[in-house]
């Protein structure tokens, strides 16, 4: 039960995280005009990964896309790439994890296959989250650098008579959305990896051996003091699972790791 919960929660957390990464990537408020120490302006500027916008006090908003590809800063291109890679990995991870969910039955898929898929999706979520966090952090670092550079030469003009205020940009809402979303995706991925451990069968060289007393159809199991009717489905050689959570509908009683003879 705990494995299913961990896996399900990991999936939901990752889903929210990836939705957040997509939202952050699409948002226009990656950087917003810094109004601190500035005259009260009727025109507010903000920029995203794909376009820059101007909002006037009148309510009119005008956005212009970055139609050039080669003319854009390499850092911006890198951030775009990181975010897109994060989204793609996350989307694939979600697709894989849907089929890996223990609560969803697809044909006669082995638990070992589900465990592998859970691990794969978990790793994908971790990498996706790291990509998003890295992308947002690179952009934030770029903003901080530019902020202090523009502060250093904020006012330029002729003999101090005419002032040209250089627009300074600070962290926009998208950065915080991206950081949180990346973190959630990362946490979701870790949870999926933890759930995988609970699902994964432990391979062993030993097999569970049943001893049958004459005249009685009883299998003696020295470690667990458990008895079950012999020659049933549970007496066959099975892969030995560790003492993880079992779904309530599992009627078979698998040998525990202490049941070796």
């Amino acid at each position: 039960m705990a494995v299913t919960a961990c896996q399900g929660l990991g999936f939901v957390v990752s889903l929210i995280g990836i939705a957040g990464i997509i939202a952050a990537t699409c948002m226009d408020q990656w950087s917003t005009q810094d109004l601190y120490n500035n005259p009260v302006t009727a025109v507010f500027n903000y920029q995203g990964l794909w376009r820059s916008c101007v909002r006037e006090s009148s309510g009119f908003t005008e956005c212009r896309g970055y139609f050039t590809l080669l003319g854009l800063p390499a850092m911006l291109q890198a951030v775009r790439a990181l975010m897109i890679v994060g989204i793609v990995l996350g989307a694939i991870g979600l697709l894989v994890s849907i089929f890996a969910l223990k609560c969803i039955r697809i044909g006669s898929m082995e638990d070992s296959a589900k465990a592998n898929m859970t691990l794969t999706s978990g790793i994908m979520f971790i990498v996706s989250g790291l990509c998003a966090i890295a992308g947002v952090s690179v952009f934030a670092n770029m903003l901080v650098t530019n902020f202090w550079m523009s502060t250093a030469n904020m006012y330029t003009g002729m003999g101090g008579m005419v002032q040209t205020v250089q627009t300074r940009y600070t962290f926009g809402a998208a950065l915080f959305v991206g950081w949180v979303a990346g973190g959630l995706t990362l946490i979701g991925g870790v949870m999926m990896c933890i759930a995988c451990r609970g699902l994964a069968p432990e391979e062993t060289n030993y097999k569970a051996v049943s001893y049958h007393a004459s005249g009685h159809s009883v299998a003696y199991k020295p470690g667990g003091f458990k008895a079950s009717t012999g020659f049933g489905s549970n007496t066959k050689n099975k892969k030995i699972y560790d003492g993880g959570a079992r779904t309530e509908d599992e009627v078979q009683s698998y040998p525990s790791k202490h049941d070796y003879v």
Epitope: Q33, P39, V40, T41, A42, V43, N45, Y46, Q47, S52, C53, V54, E56, S57, S58, G59, F60, E62, R64, V162, Q163, T164, V165, Q166, T167
Partner: antibody, heavy 118, light 113 residues
Framework: QVQLVESGGGVVQPGRSLRLSCAAS????????VYWVRQAPGKGLEWVAV???????NYNSALMSRFTISKDNSKSTLYLQMNSLRAEDTAVYYC????????????WGQGTLVTVSS | DIVMTQSPDSLAVSLGERATINCKSS????????????LAWYQQKPGQPPKLLIY???TRESGVPDRFTGSGSGTDFTLTISSLQAEDVAVYYC?????????FGQGTKVEIK
């Protein structure tokens, strides 16, 4: 067509209050910002205040403590509440509509004269 | 507050001649986000309210004759009347539309010589 009609002007004693109104027609106050601009006799234009479509307001810092701009969207009317009036507040008060893009006043009323005198 | 300084204070031009009015702001009115200048020009005839001629420093308001041209960027702006007509006799004002309060220039009176 767009029309702005100011009213409420007149002669008032120093220290008293007065409320100017501006009736707007041909557009809605929920879609456009509206300004108050004043002009003292023989002088230039002085920007007083603005109320934006969303209800946000901005003031001339020199007048902010005494003047309050407001609007009633349902009545399509703009108001300017003027308190503690002084002789230097004597002027023609105009209301004007913001054009919506690049922030300029495209329609003006004929103005209402406020005279502050004892 | 942004200070708008117009020059000259008054201008006498012959009919059909060019009239040029300058406006200087104490701070740049060019917005880096959209590369637009937030400056407007108004014409006010005696006994009338002002009339919008130019917005965005260079965009002519609809219905305004094409002899009126706005130019300039940043802190220096110009209103040019290419061929002065009798009906152009008025006071012309420039206005900062970028920073609150939206200050006006002191005005330039245009007369016929």
């Amino acid at each position: 067509q767009v029309q702005l009609v100011e009213s409420g002007g007149g002669v008032v004693q120093p220290g008293r209050s007065l409320r100017l109104s501006c009736a707007a027609s041909g557009f809605t106050l929920t879609s456009y910002g509206v300004y108050w601009v004043r002009q003292a006799p023989g002088k230039g234009l002085e920007w007083v205040a603005v109320v934006w479509a969303g209800g946000n307001t901005n003031y001339n810092s020199a007048l902010m403590s005494r003047f309050t701009i407001s609007k009633d969207n349902s009545k399509s009317t703009l108001y300017l509440q003027m308190n503690s009036l002084r002789a230097e507040d004597t002027a023609v008060y105009y209301c004007a509509r913001d054009r919506g893009r690049l922030l300029a006043m495209d329609y003006w009323g004929q103005g209402t004269l406020v005279t502050v005198s004892s | 507050d942004i200070v708008m300084t117009q020059s000259p204070d008054s201008l006498a031009v012959s009919l059909g001649e060019r009239a040029t009015i300058n406006c200087k702001s104490s701070q740049s009115l060019l917005n880096s986000g959209n590369q637009k200048n937030y400056l407007a020009w108004y014409q006010q005839k005696p006994g009338q309210p002002p009339k919008l001629l130019i917005y965005g420093a260079s965009t002519r308001e609809s219905g305004v004759p094409d002899r009126f041209t706005g130019s300039g960027s940043g802190t220096d702006f110009t209103l040019t009347i290419s061929s002065l007509q009798a009906e152009d006799v008025a006071v012309y004002y420039c206005q900062n539309d970028h920073f609150f309060p939206f200050t006006f220039g002191q005005g330039t009176k245009v007369e016929i010589k």
